[in-house]
Interface confidence: low
């Protein structure tokens, strides 16, 4: 018969107040003959947790039938866990002796500690929108977890980020801990549909990390590009001029037409379309009444996007009998 080993497979057992804890212990040999007892702590002050033969242990039950022939599983369950139950538990084999049993071998011990799950991570983005190519910061917070060991990762559209700083508080002993992490993310022009994800992994989550998300659409402003063009065909005394506002986000946009510096109040036709990347295009048509005797007309399309400074583009219509090519230039 091989030498007896006392196997306690768990080094650490995380338990929740009020729940039941299972402490595993198996032996590799039936010899020597004698009982297996459970203790908390070591040395003369150790506390007896379970003795099958004698004593009253109302919160302790065995996993296996200890009376079963050749039983080698001495695992126990402790119900209604309280903070007072934390400590290291040992299953100990005694050799039958006279007048009393003699301690023969102890398992390596299982540390029982109170575990608490982290709260769902909350991700907060910047207070104001920023344009592409700039860096914005996102914070992630999760609270109330124990033990202190925790892993936090950041992702942008599934790609792991590396530019972040994380703190776990407090640094000393505590019943519960909090984590706060700040990630720096460079915005790309196509990030309207992008997400940043904060992922928290903790031993209490049993391999299923918690995730918090933020949409970059809340943090990005994609400024528009403007183009003003004159339609080649004239219809009587009217010329159709188009202002195309491309690739902007968010949707908030004001467009005004000016004719020779005078803001035009009349209605104009327009359409709004959404691009695949989440940005928008706005097209506005303006009909200009012209006559051959009239002075040259300078049309200006002015766009105010998301409360920013207005940008404009102008088009000079040279109104002659033989209408010349249009020309377009930009104004700040």
């Amino acid at each position: 018969e091989e030498e007896l080993q006392m196997i306690q497979p768990e080094k650490l057992l995380l338990v929740t107040v009020g729940k039941t804890a299972t402490l595993h212990c198996t032996v590799t040999s039936l010899l020597p003959v004698g009982p297996v007892l459970w203790f908390r702590g070591v040395g003369p002050g150790r506390e007896l947790i379970y003795n099958q033969k004698e004593g009253h242990f109302p919160r302790v039950t065995t996993v296996s039938d200890l009376t079963k022939r050749n039983n080698m599983d001495f695992s126990i369950r402790i119900s209604s866990i309280t903070p007072a139950d934390v400590g290291t538990y040992y299953c100990v084999k005694f050799r039958k002796g006279s007048p009393e049993n003699v301690e023969f071998k102890s398992g390596p011990g299982t540390e029982m500690a109170l575990g608490a799950k982290p709260s769902a991570p909350v991700v907060l983005g910047p207070a104001a929108r920023t344009t592409p190519e700039h860096t914005v910061s996102f914070t992630c917070e999760s609270h109330g977890f124990s033990p202190r060991d925790i892993t936090l990762k950041w992702f942008k559209n599934g790609n792991e980020l590396s530019d972040f700083q994380t703190n776990v508080d407090p640094t000393g002993q505590s019943v519960a801990y909090s984590i706060r992490s700040t990630a720096r993310v460079v915005l790309d022009p196509w990030d309207v549909r992008s997400q940043v994800i904060c992922e928290v992994a903790h031993v209490t989550l049993q391999g299923d990390p918690l995730r918090g998300t933020a949409n970059l659409s809340e943090a990005i402003r994609v400024p528009p590009t403007l183009e003003v063009t004159q339609q080649p065909m004239r219809v009587g005394n009217q010329v159709n001029v188009t202002c195309q506002v491309r690739k902007f986000y968010p949707q908030s946009l004001q467009l005004t037409w000016s004719e020779n510096g005078n803001v035009c109040q009349r209605e104009t036709a327009s359409t709004l379309t959404e691009n695949k990347d989440g940005t928008y295009n706005w097209t506005s048509w303006f009909l200009v009444n012209i006559s051959d005797q009239r002075d040259d007309v300078v049309l200006t399309c002015q766009v105010k996007h998301d409360g920013q400074l207005a940008v404009s583009k102008r088009l000079a219509l040279e109104v002659t009998v033989h209408q010349k090519d249009q020309s377009s230039d930009a104004t700040p």
């Epitope: 196997i7 080094k11 590799t28 296996s64």
Partner: antibody, heavy 114, light 108 residues
Framework: EVQLVESGGGVVRPGGSLRLSCAAS????????MSWVRQAPGKGLEWVSG????????GYADSVKGRFTISRDNAKNSLYLQMNSLRAEDTAVYYC???????WGQGTLVTVSR | SSELTQDPAVSVALGQTVRITCQGD??????ASWYQQKPGQAPVLVIY???NRPSGIPDRFSGSSSGNTASLTITGAQAEDEADYYC???????????FGGGTKLTVL
């Protein structure tokens, strides 16, 4: 002598079924949890399924959950693995092992091929 | 489920000491077991629990554990120790078992 002997392997088409058996001897079978572990050709070991001493608790790897069923018959000192909806990626040597994997069988080869 | 990570290959000079490591979150809570497998053979358990050796395993094999890392140490490696070594443990949920990818040990 402590021994585990697997049987039931063979060649089967994708979508087919096989039942593996493991005959235990030389130890008190119903004192131990048991596992099935597999090893694809040239690859590492992969735990497939486990069962406690009386069959009251079972566990499965995600890759086989819903397709494989582990069971045991303590009166016959036998462990079983019923494998349904077999796929090419299930091709492997299947080992029967005592839960802590202190004792292993020699394995039985399962080949899933058209 | 959890993962256990091992170095794919490690080499050691004959008679020297080598350490093979296994990392994973589940090892904070569970001890690893270690297996030796030679070509064409079934695996053999060499270390289990805190540092237990089955009978017949030479005492040059030992195990240790710290945080999320388990280690198998061979003190005075012999030619016959050349093999693949696998670690395993229960996963973080405690309901499943997970194996490391294996480490090929070459004795030079």
């Amino acid at each position: 002598e402590v021994q585990l002997v697997e049987s039931g392997g063979g060649v089967v088409r994708p979508g087919g079924s096989l039942r593996l058996s493991c005959a235990a001897s030389g130890f008190t079978f119903d004192d131990y949890g048991m596992s099935w572990v597999r090893q694809a050709p040239g690859k590492g070991l992969e735990w497939v399924s486990g069962i406690n001493w009386n069959g009251g608790s079972t566990g499965y790897a995600d890759s086989v959950k819903g397709r494989f069923t582990i069971s045991r018959d303590n009166a016959k000192n036998s462990l079983y693995l019923q494998m349904n909806s077999l796929r090419a990626e299930d091709t492997a040597v299947y080992y029967c092992a005592r839960w802590i994997a202190k004792v292993w069988g020699q394995g039985t080869l399962v080949t899933v091929s058209r | 489920s959890s993962e256990l990570t091992q170095d794919p290959a490690v080499s050691v000079a004959l008679g020297q000491t080598v350490r093979i490591t296994c990392q994973g979150d589940s090892l904070r809570s569970y001890y690893a077991s270690w297996y030796q497998q030679k070509p064409g053979q079934a695996p053999v358990l060499v270390i289990y629990g805190k540092n237990n050796r089955p009978s017949g395993i030479p005492d040059r094999f030992s195990g240790s554990s710290s945080g999320n890392t388990a280690s198998l140490t061979i003190t005075g490696a012999q030619a016959e120790d050349e093999a693949d070594y696998y670690c395993n443990s229960r996963d973080s949920s405690g309901n499943h078992v997970v194996f490391g990818g294996g480490t090929k040990l070459t004795v030079l």
